[in-house]
């Protein structure tokens, strides 16, 4: 019977008794930088080259004893999760390993960024097909780690990683924080995130999804024949990397950014239960977990986007946070977030020649997030337009007047502390969807762009009670773009997208009573594009 | 996921024209920053990864490490360069007291130097 | 799904032997430490003896130890449990049963956490007497 | 060796009752801890396993508790189904122990 970690990564037109999807990515060479290996095992012989790295820490203890099986453990069971006869994601990729973890799976920054530049190398001397590495290993946060994986992400090599069995945040590790990899937790065959002794999982922004992590059977070094089951966020990175693999192999010529945003696309949502994470880092933590696409090809129709949340800004009167997307992204809205709800609003702002998305704190505020919603959207030609606060008791208003550009979100930014204190709402007038409007001492920005087909719609929800929680989707074949709240209501928290949803939180209202401002209008902006799925339909 | 400028402990070391003369301080106006592990049982001090400024030539970065070695053994410090990073970041990987870290944040090229730490399996 | 049958139960007089076997399905047979589990007529649960993954480990309840051994076979998909110098006492419906549990790493520490015995098998019945 | 005592040896209690049944360690095991159901002529069923983990299929009625010495079962709302005789085993090594059983009847 198929394991349970490779039935909840199997859309269900693959499953059957033996699971063997379409292409078990051949093309695709994965790195793995771990502990030794026992490359006769009958799971992965012949489908691993243990390359000549290694670069290892000496065992800690005078009593330590090498046993080669257990100096190869780690090693030997993620190289059968990725690619195992068995027991493997991606049954078709070869592997390259490289030793950078000791017989106690302990290394060092620097061992692992010598590996990370062989790679490199190796790729410079004899390009092949696309690469994947896989880091199954945390350490503290490390600048220059992140920096040597944004580096090596840069030249086309996609890198997996553990996000870390801390039960902690996974900004505090490297390389988890680094913004280029591709960091996954551990889940359950119950969804659950995954517990190992008394920590688990780590979670938070710096995690792209989760995968199966928690009793995977594969390769044990006991012997050639043998298999064990082992758990954390290893095995869950490795399910991943045997994912990029499978649709790398469908699809060569994917980039980094594209591959991302089809494994978030593809993941199963909303499945995990939250409770577990830390109340502050339940809204931070991407509730998906992995899947193989339903099909090799025909996803490039769609247009995918993420949301990038930032870093907390921190309580200071003036502080600021900013939410980036990744450089083949384009920025098409900007939100924010305050859990004490003091905040001042939020601004698309060029940073480096890019879009950035920058949130500001108000004063006696505990702090506040910028979210980036950060899309793939081929020949796009974005641009913020801004309208300075009117004087008008109607509100700010500013639309995308350029010929050919549609808008794709709104933000409002305000100098004042307490905006709309005891201020009716302004309502935005029906009949003109390429028009952000604000209170009159906000400044409103308006993300216009214009790509080949793009085509976006407001969709609106409100609802005339006090409510924590507000939310608007776009419908199948739209996706969600801009996330936004109605100006008026002063107890809003801010507004942020979960895949295709615009969430609108505002404060418990238990504590701020049914007044004339309860009223909370969510808003969503919804595009396709029809140039895209054309491409697509020609395609096949 | 995590900003450059992140959680992370960071010491930034103040550079003060010494004995070793203006003309091998870095370009005026940046200061080269050491940062080190905040979880303390991970720290591994005493070998330090020194980065150079991203288009730092592999031949300037030896010349830097031979120059950290000239300086320090002047006042009495051994030390041995592990790696010379090319390929990915310009840099070198140094076993060295801790002593001489404000001598090599002053180095010409330098962008920052990280004391090295343990990374686990997971 | 994950199948245990026993066989090899019987009659046996004190002083024989006896030879159990348990036949698994799947891959998931050897990925994890397996146990004998007996329970005399009327009476509770008791823990015999288990084995790990590749048969390197074992461990015994002290009333069998020196008598019964405990053995798998990964090729086989199979669990022995060979019964010597059978006394009364060793009367009982015997199960055989999967040990699930996980090894993980955490801050250099290889560690194994325990489940408990998630498939049985339906038992088979050993009787000694004269 | 770890001794498992279980309390009460016999309980009788109603359909729709809340039912609790208590074992104690002869020293801690930390959470190391397992309960099974029994039905007549039938192998154990895993119920919860660490203290308080609910094996994946159980009914959501099934909890546990406990840490150290003293460890519980609670049924919140009995149904027809869960008469049967009750199990803790201890997995502190990999030696282990289970108690003597409770036995819930039908009052």
């Known amino acids: 019977s198929i394991p349970w970690n490779l039935e909840r990564i199997t859309p269900p037109r693959y499953r059957a008794d033996e699971y063997q999807p379409p292409d078990g990515g051949s093309l695709v060479e994965v790195y793995l930088l771990d502990t030794s290996i026992q490359s006769d095992h009958r799971e992965i012989e012949g489908r691993v080259m243990v390359t000549d790295f290694e670069n290892v820490p000496e065992e800690d203890g005078t009593r330590f004893h090498r046993q080669a099986s257990k100096c190869d453990s780690h090693g030997t069971h993620l190289a059968g999760v990725v690619s195992g006869r068995d027991a493997g994601v991606a049954k078709g990729a070869s592997m390259r390993s490289l030793r950078v973890l000791n017989c106690q799976g302990k290394g060092t920054v620097s061992g692992t960024l010598i590996g990370l530049e062989f790679i490199r190398k190796s790729q410079l001397v004899q390009p092949v097909g696309p690469l994947v590495v896989l880091l199954p290993l945390a350490g503290g946060y490390s600048r220059v780690l992140n920096a040597a994986c944004q580096r090596l992400a840069r030249a086309g090599v996609v890198l997996v990683t553990a996000a870390g069995n801390f039960r902690d945040d996974a900004c505090l590790y490297s390389p988890a924080s680094a913004p280029e990899v591709i960091t996954v937790g551990a889940t359950n065959a119950q969804d659950q995130p995954v517990t190992l002794g008394t920590l688990g999982t780590n979670f938070g922004r710096c995690v792209d999804l989760f995968a199966p992590g928690e009793d995977i059977i594969g390769a044990s070094s006991d012997c050639s024949t043998c298999f064990v089951s082992q758990s954390g966020t290893s095995q869950a990175a490795a399910h991943v990397a045997g994912i990029a693999a499978m649709m790398l192999s469908a699809e060569p010529e994917l980039t980094l950014a594209e591959l991302r945003q089809r494994l978030i696309h593809f993941s199963a949502k909303d499945v995990i239960n939250e409770a577990w994470f830390p109340e502050d880092q339940r809204v931070l933590t991407p509730n998906l977990v992995a899947a193989l696409p339903p099909s090799t090809h025909g996803a490039g129709w769609q247009l995918f986007c993420r949301t990038v949340w930032s870093a907390h800004s921190g309580p200071t009167r003036m502080a600021t946070a900013v939410a980036r997307c990744a450089p083949d992204e384009e920025l098409l809205s900007c939100s924010s977030f305050s859990r004490s709800g003091k905040r001042r609003g939020e601004r698309m702002e060029a940073q480096g020649g890019k879009l950035v998305c920058r949130a500001h704190n108000a004063f006696g505020g505990e702090g506040v997030y910028a979210i980036a919603r950060c899309c793939l959207l081929p020949q796009a030609n974005c641009s913020v337009h801004t309208a300075p606060p009117a004087e008008a008791s109607m509100g700010t208003r500013v639309h995308c007047h350029q010929q050919g550009h549609v808008l794709t979100g709104c933000s409002s930014h305000w100098e004042v502390e307490d905006l709309g204190t005891h201020k009716p709402p302004v309502l935005r007038p029906r009949g003109q969807p390429n028009q952000c409007v604000g209170h009159r001492e906000a400044s409103i920005h308006a993300s216009c762009c214009h790509a080949p087909g793009l085509e976006c719609k407001v969709k609106e929800h409100g609802i005339p009670a006090p409510q924590e929680q507000v939310t608007v989707a776009c419908e199948e074949g739209w996706t969600l773009t801009g996330c936004s709240a109605l100006p008026g209501t002063s107890h809003v928290l801010g507004a942020y997208a979960v895949d295709n949803t615009c969430v609108v939180r505002s404060r418990d209202v238990s504590t701020t009573g049914s007044t004339s401002e309860g009223a909370v209008t969510a808003v969503a902006i919804c595009c396709r594009s029809r140039h895209l799925a054309q491409a697509s339909q020609e395609l096949q | 996921q995590e900003d450059e400028d992140g959680d992370y402990e960071e010491l930034v070391l103040a550079l003060r024209s010494e004995e070793d003369g203006l003309a091998e301080a870095p370009e005026h106006g940046t200061t080269a920053t050491f940062h080190r592990c905040a979880k303390d049982p991970w720290r591994l001090p005493g070998t330090y990864v020194v980065v150079l400024k991203e288009e730092t030539h592999l031949s300037q970065s030896e010349r830097t490490a031979r120059r950290l070695q000239a300086q320090a053994a002047r006042r009495g410090y051994l030390t041995k360069i592990l790696h010379v990073f090319h390929g990915l970041l310009p840099g070198f990987l140094v076993k060295m007291s801790g002593d001489l870290l404000e001598l090599a944040l002053k180095l010409p090229h330098v962008d920052y130097i990280e004391e090295d730490s343990s990374v686990f399996a997971q | 799904e994950v199948q245990l049958v026993e066989s090899g139960g019987g009659l046996v007089q004190p002083g024989g032997s006896l030879r159990l076997s348990c036949a698994a399905s799947?891959?998931?047979?050897?990925?994890?430490?397996m146990s004998w589990v007996r329970q005399a007529p009327g009476k509770g649960l008791e823990w015999v003896a288990n084995?790990?993954?590749?048969?390197?480990?074992?461990y015994y309840v002290d009333s069998v130890k020196g008598r019964f051994t405990i053995s798998r076979d990964i090729a086989k998909n199979s669990l022995y449990l060979q019964m010597n110098s059978l006394r009364a006492e060793d009367t009982a419906v015997y199960y055989c049963?999967?040990?699930?549990?996980?090894?993980?790493?955490?801050?250099?520490?290889?560690?194994?956490?325990?489940?408990?015995?998630?498939?049985w098998g339906q038992g088979t019945t050993v009787t000694v007497s004269s | 060796d770890i001794q498992m005592t279980q309390s009460p040896s016999t309980l009788s209690a109603s359909v729709g009752d809340r039912v609790t049944i208590t074992c104690r360690a002869s020293?801690?095991?930390?959470?190391?801890l397992a309960w099974y159901q029994q039905k007549p002529g039938k192998a154990p069923k895993l119920l919860i396993y660490?203290?308080?983990s609910l094996e994946s299929g159980v009914p959501s009625r099934f909890s546990g508790s406990g840490s150290g010495t003293e460890f519980t079962l609670t049924i919140s709302s009995l149904q027809p189904d869960d008469f049967a005789t009750y199990y803790c085993?201890?997995?502190?090594?990999?030696?282990?122990?289970f108690g003597q059983g409770t036995k819930l009847e039908i009052k």
């Open positions: 049963a999967r040990d699930r549990g996980t090894y993980y790493y955490q801050d250099g520490n290889y560690n194994y956490y325990y489940y408990g015995m998630d498939v």
């Open positions: 660490k203290a308080s």
């Open positions: 020293q801690s095991i930390s959470s190391w």
């Open positions: 085993q201890q997995y502190n090594s990999y030696s282990y122990t």
């Open positions: 799947g891959i998931t047979f050897s990925s994890y430490w």
């Open positions: 084995i790990k993954q590749d048969g390197s480990e074992k």
